[in-house]
Interface confidence: low
């Protein structure tokens, strides 16, 4: 269980990650970039790799800059991995990152922090019963 | 508390229709992957079908292909099962079942069952 | 479509034994089974899932093991509530399929 705990952690990083960026919406290139969203029962962790995928980049105007680079590095790092991930199922055939529909940083960031999200209360309620309204 | 409740069972003739509905609560139903198990008087369980969360993925069991289709409606926390053309050997108590995301392998929600009988 | 055979169909046994059930799938399904628990008129209640997860708050005398084409599924001391018919199911490839189901009765 204990990787599935590191894992928890590392997801609520990212958030904290995508967060962060969120404040500094304005100095990312402009440039549209395939979000998911709606993402496909099973294929979520296929989403969660174009979102890492995608050439999310800093603006390069004045002092941020090292504090955004730094945060797209953290961001693209791998989640330790997990049985569910690394046993993304076979049987489906998951749509390409460039099936996506393309947004723009913000709506981007936006999405990315939904799925990450959802991520966190799956694994959650794979292990636990009860009310899952969250 | 997570819930599933079926209905729309009923006594039908062969050939004739049926809808099923299941409405679920206590859990974000639009993240999940939804089935329709039977299972026959006396006998063992047969899956019939399946749905993604978003409705890109159906399948369903080679007995009741072209006959049965699955949908869903997120917006109203809904799974449904249009029955046609249904023949005696489609008599059973059907479940609603949640099946988990994310690689998890297992149904591990079932409602209560409605039961369907086809008879002339 | 994959096959799965429970064996056996049928068993008896007695309070505080140690019974092992068995599934053996027609092809190599990784760990992708779940076991269910069902009584007589009511739903199957998943057990485990993924082969040898077991699902929260069910009792830890229950266990699974297996990962290929075999699985089993070990009761390590039979309760009295845990007379019932048991099914395993695979997931690994569309029909998802269920074995024939094993009947636990009482000696």
């Known amino acids: 269980m204990q990787g599935q705990d590191r894992h928890m952690i590392r997801m609520r990083q990212l958030i904290d990650i995508v967060d962060q960026l969120k404040n500094y919406v304005n100095d990312l290139v402009p440039e549209f970039l395939p979000a998911p969203e709606d993402v496909e029962t099973n294929c979520e962790w296929s989403a969660f790799s174009c979102f890492q995928k995608a050439q999310l980049k800093s603006a390069n105007t004045g002092n941020n800059e090292r504090i955004i680079n730094v945060s797209i590095k953290k961001l693209k790092r791998k989640p330790p991995s997990t049985n569910a991930g690394r046993r993304q199922k076979h049987r489906l055939t998951c749509p390409s990152c460039d099936s996506y529909e393309k947004k723009p940083p913000k709506e981007f960031l936006e999405r990315f922090k939904s799925l990450l999200q959802k991520m966190i209360h799956q694994h959650l309620s794979s292990r636990t019963h009860g009310s899952e309204d969250s | 508390e997570v819930q599933l409740v079926e209905s729309g069972g009923g006594l039908v003739k062969p050939g004739g229709s049926l809808r099923l509905s299941c409405a679920a609560s206590?859990?974000?139903?639009?993240?999940?992957?939804m089935n329709w198990v039977r299972q026959a008087p006396g006998k063992g369980l047969e899956w019939v079908s399946s749905i993604t969360s978003g409705s890109y993925y159906i399948h369903y069991a080679d007995s009741v292909k072209g006959r049965f289709t699955i949908s869903r409606d997120n917006a109203k926390n809904s799974l449904y099962l249009q029955m046609n053309s249904l023949r005696a050997e489609d008599t059973a108590v059907y479940y609603c079942?949640?099946?988990?995301?994310?690689?998890?392998?297992?149904?591990?929600?079932w409602g209560q069952g409605t039961t369907v009988t086809v008879s002339s | 479509a994959i096959q799965l055979t429970q064996s056996p169909s049928s068993l008896s046994a007695s309070v505080g034994d140690r019974v092992t059930i068995t599934c053996r799938a027609s092809n190599d399904i990784d760990s992708a089974l779940a076991w269910y628990q069902q009584k007589p008129g009511k739903a199957p209640k998943i057990l485990i899932h993924d082969a040898s997860s077991l699902e929260s708050g069910v009792p830890s005398r229950f266990s699974g093991s297996g990962s290929g084409t075999d699985f089993t599924l070990t009761i390590s001391s039979l309760q009295p509530e845990d007379f019932a018919t048991y099914y395993c199911q695979q997931f690994n490839s569309y029909p998802y399929t269920f074995g024939q189901g094993t009947k636990l009765e009482i000696k």
């Open positions: 079942v949640r099946e988990r995301g994310w690689g998890y392998y297992g149904m591990d929600v």
């Open positions: 206590g859990f974000i139903f639009s993240s999940y992957s």
